[in-house]
C-alpha cells in the first residue's frame, strides 16, 4: 500500500475525510497495508492490527469489510465516506475494536450498507444520529437490515449520567431511519427495561435478541405491531412472569418463536395464566425446560408440570398481624 491509493470524501458532510484525498491518481483497487483483500469475494479484512483509524485507501469493490479487534476508539462523521463512495459495501463488522464513541453520521455515504456489527465495544457515547446521520425529525431511510449491538455496554465507571437503554434507543429511533431493520441484536447489555416505544417504531423486525440482559418485566412493552417477528430471544434475563397482555400479544404474532430459558420464574399465584398459556402454545421453544426459581419450595419445578393448586400466594397479613 502507499499514500497514493484512493480515499475520500464529501467535504460538506464528512469533514473528517475531506483531507484524505490522494496526492496522485489512485492505484485502482489496491489493498491497504495491514489488510487482506479478496476481490473475488469482495472482502477486505483488517483484523487484529491495532488500527486507530479506518483505512483511507479501501478498494471500491469492497462488499464485506472486517475491522475487528482494533483500537479505533472513535468513529467520526463520514468515517467511511470516500470519493468515489464505497457503493458496494454491504456488511461492516467493527466488533471488538475498543470503540467508545460513535458520532452522528459515522455511517453516512454507504448506500448499500445492510449489516452492521458494533458488538463488544464499550459504547459510552453513541450519538442519537449515529445511524440516521441527521438530526431531522424524519431522516432518509437507512439501508440497514441487520444491526448487531451485543455487549456494547461500557463498564459501570465509564457510563455517563444517563440511561444506557435510553441512549441506545435514541439511536435506534432517531429520524425513523431504521424502519427497514429486520434483525436487531441487543444481547448482554445489562438492560433493566425496554423503553416502551422502541418496538412500535421498528415495524419490520423479524429477529429481536434481548438475551442475557436484566429485564425484569415486559409489562409495558408492546409486541403488537411486530407482525413480521419470527424470533424473540429473552433467555438469561430476570423475568419473573409474563402477564396476560404480553401472552396475548405474543400468541397473536403469526410467525413468532420465543426463547425464555434461564429466567428466574416466580411460581406463585401470578404465574397461573402463564402456565396455562405455556401448556397450550406452540410459540415457546424449549418450553419443557422452563423451571421455577422462586419460591424456595418450588425451585427447579418444571412450569409445564404445574397445576393451579401449586401456584399459591402467601396471604397478605393485615398490618396489625405483621411482624418485623
Amino acid at each position: 500500500s502507499s499514500p497514493t491509493s484512493s480515499a475520500s470524501s464529501f467535504s460538506s458532510s464528512a469533514p473528517f475525510l475531506a483531507s484524505a484525498v490522494s496526492a496522485q491518481p489512485p492505484l485502482p483497487d489496491q489493498c491497504p497495508a495491514l489488510c487482506e483483500c479478496s476481490e473475488a469475494a469482495r472482502t477486505v479484512k483488517c483484523v487484529n492490527r491495532n488500527l486507530t483509524e479506518v483505512p483511507t485507501d479501501l478498494p471500491a469493490y469492497v462488499r464485506n469489510l472486517f475491522l475487528t479487534g482494533n483500537q479505533l476508539a472513535v468513529l467520526p462523521a463520514g468515517a467511511f465516506a470516500r470519493r468515489p463512495p464505497l457503493a458496494e459495501l454491504a456488511a461492516l463488522n467493527l466488533s471488538g475494536s475498543r470503540l467508545d464513541e460513535v458520532r452522528a453520521g459515522a455511517f453516512e455515504h454507504l448506500p448499500s450498507l445492510r449489516q452492521l456489527d458494533l458488538s463488544h465495544n464499550p459504547l459510552a457515547d453513541l450519538s442519537p444520529f449515529a445511524f440516521s446521520g441527521s438530526n431531522a425529525s424524519v431522516s432518509a431511510p437507512s439501508p440497514l437490515v441487520e444491526l448487531i449491538l451485543n455487549h456494547i455496554v461500557p463498564p459501570e465507571d465509564e457510563r455517563q449520567n444517563r440511561s444506557f437503554e435510553g441512549m441506545v434507543v435514541a439511536a435506534l429511533l432517531a429520524g425513523r431511519a431504521l424502519q427497514g431493520l429486520r434483525r436487531l441484536e441487543l444481547a448482554s447489555n445489562h438492560f433493566l427495561y425496554l423503553p416502551r416505544d422502541v418496538l412500535a417504531q421498528l415495524p419490520s423486525l423479524r429477529h429481536l435478541d434481548l438475551s442475557n440482559n436484566s429485564l425484569v418485566s415486559l409489562t409495558y412493552v408492546s409486541f403488537r405491531n411486530l407482525t413480521h417477528l419470527e424470533s424473540l430471544h429473552l433467555e438469561d434475563n430476570a423475568l419473573k412472569v409474563l402477564h396476560n397482555g404480553t401472552l396475548a400479544e405474543l400468541q397473536g404474532l403469526p410467525h413468532i418463536r420465543v426463547f425464555l430459558d434461564n429466567n428466574p420464574w416466580v411460581c406463585d399465584c401470578h404465574m397461573a395464566d402463564m402456565v396455562t398459556w405455556l401448556k397450550e402454545t406452540e410459540v415457546v421453544q424449549g418450553k419443557d425446560r422452563l423451571t421455577c426459581a422462586y419460591p424456595e419450595k418450588m425451585r427447579n419445578r418444571v412450569l409445564l408440570e404445574l397445576n393451579s393448586a401449586d401456584l399459591d400466594c402467601d396471604p397478605i397479613l393485615p398490618p396489625s398481624l405483621q411482624t418485623s
Epitope: 483531507s19 486507530t52 483511507t56 458520532r103
Partner: antibody
C-alpha cells in the same frame, strides 16, 4: 530517549520539489502515527499531514492536498514528506511529530525542525 | 474547519503571579468520552512541547504549576506561579476532526 531528527530542507524555486525525512529513535516507531507540522516565519503552527502507524491512513491539509505526499518506512524508522509544486507560502520550518492516534492523540514528541525556503 | 481563537494575544505577568490563557473553539470539541483539546509551549528557537492533553491531563515531566480546564468550546491554561523559564508562546490545538488546527498563539512575557 525519544528523538526525531528532520532533514532535507533547503532553498528551492517555486514549482520545485523537495523530499523531507525524519529519522526516529528511542521508541517503537511502528507503533505510532506520525505528523508533519509547519511554522511559517514569525507565524503560528499549521498541521500539514498525518500517516497512521501501519500506513493504512493518510490525511492532508487542504493547502497541500494533491502536492504533498506523506509516507514512512517502518523498517528504517523513517518518515518522509514529498513536496511537489512548491509555492512561496510553503516557506516554513517543518517539524515531524509523533502521536498515538489521529483524533484521540496529540503531538507528544517533536523534532527540531528543518527549514524549507521557497523563493525565486 | 474548526477555528481556535486564543486570548489574549500577548500577556505580561509578574514572577510568582498567576497567568491565565483562554482558548475558544468555533464548535464543541468535547464528547462525553473525551475532550479533544491540547496545549503546547514553544520557547524561542525551539520546537513546541506538549504540556496538557485532553484539556486537563498534565503531560509527564511538566511542572504541576501548569493546569488546564474546560470543556465544549471554552478552555483555559493556567500557570499558578509564573517562573522565568515559562516565557514562551502557548498554543491550543483540537483533534476533533481533520484538519487539526491550532490557536494563533499567546505570547507570555514577564512584567
Amino acid at each position: 530517549e525519544v528523538q526525531l531528527v528532520e532533514s532535507g530542507g533547503g532553498l528551492v524555486q517555486p514549482g520545485g520539489s523537495l523530499r523531507l525525512s525524519c529519522a526516529a529513535s528511542g521508541f517503537t516507531f511502528s507503533n505510532f502515527g506520525m505528523h508533519w507540522v509547519r511554522q511559517a516565519p514569525g507565524k503560528g503552527l499549521e498541521w500539514v499531514a498525518y500517516i497512521s502507524s501501519g500506513s493504512t491512513s493518510f490525511y492532508y491539509a487542504d493547502t497541500v492536498k494533491g502536492r504533498f505526499t506523506i509516507s514512512r518506512d517502518n523498517a528504517k524508522n523513517s518518515l518522509y514528506l514529498q513536496m511537489n509544486s512548491l509555492r512561496d507560502e510553503d516557506t516554513a520550518v517543518y517539524y515531524c511529530s509523533r502521536t498515538n492516534s489521529l483524533l484521540r492523540g496529540f503531538f507528544d514528541a517533536w523534532g527540531q525542525g528543518t527549514t524549507v525556503t521557497v523563493s525565486s | 474547519d474548526i477555528v481556535m481563537t486564543q486570548s489574549p494575544d500577548s500577556l505580561a505577568v509578574s514572577l510568582g503571579e498567576r497567568a491565565t490563557i483562554n482558548c475558544r473553539a468555533s464548535q464543541s470539541v468535547s464528547s462525553s468520552s473525551y475532550t479533544y483539546l491540547h496545549w503546547y509551549q514553544q520557547k524561542p528557537g525551539q520546537p513546541p512541547k506538549l504540556l496538557i492533553y485532553s484539556a486537563s491531563n498534565l503531560e509527564s515531566g511538566v511542572p504541576d504549576r501548569f493546569s488546564g480546564s474546560g470543556s465544549g468550546t471554552d478552555f483555559t491554561l493556567t500557570i499558578s506561579s509564573l517562573q522565568a523559564e515559562d516565557v514562551a508562546v502557548y498554543y491550543c490545538q483540537h483533534s476533533w476532526e481533520i484538519p487539526l488546527t491550532f490557536g494563533q498563539g499567546t505570547k507570555l512575557e514577564i512584567k
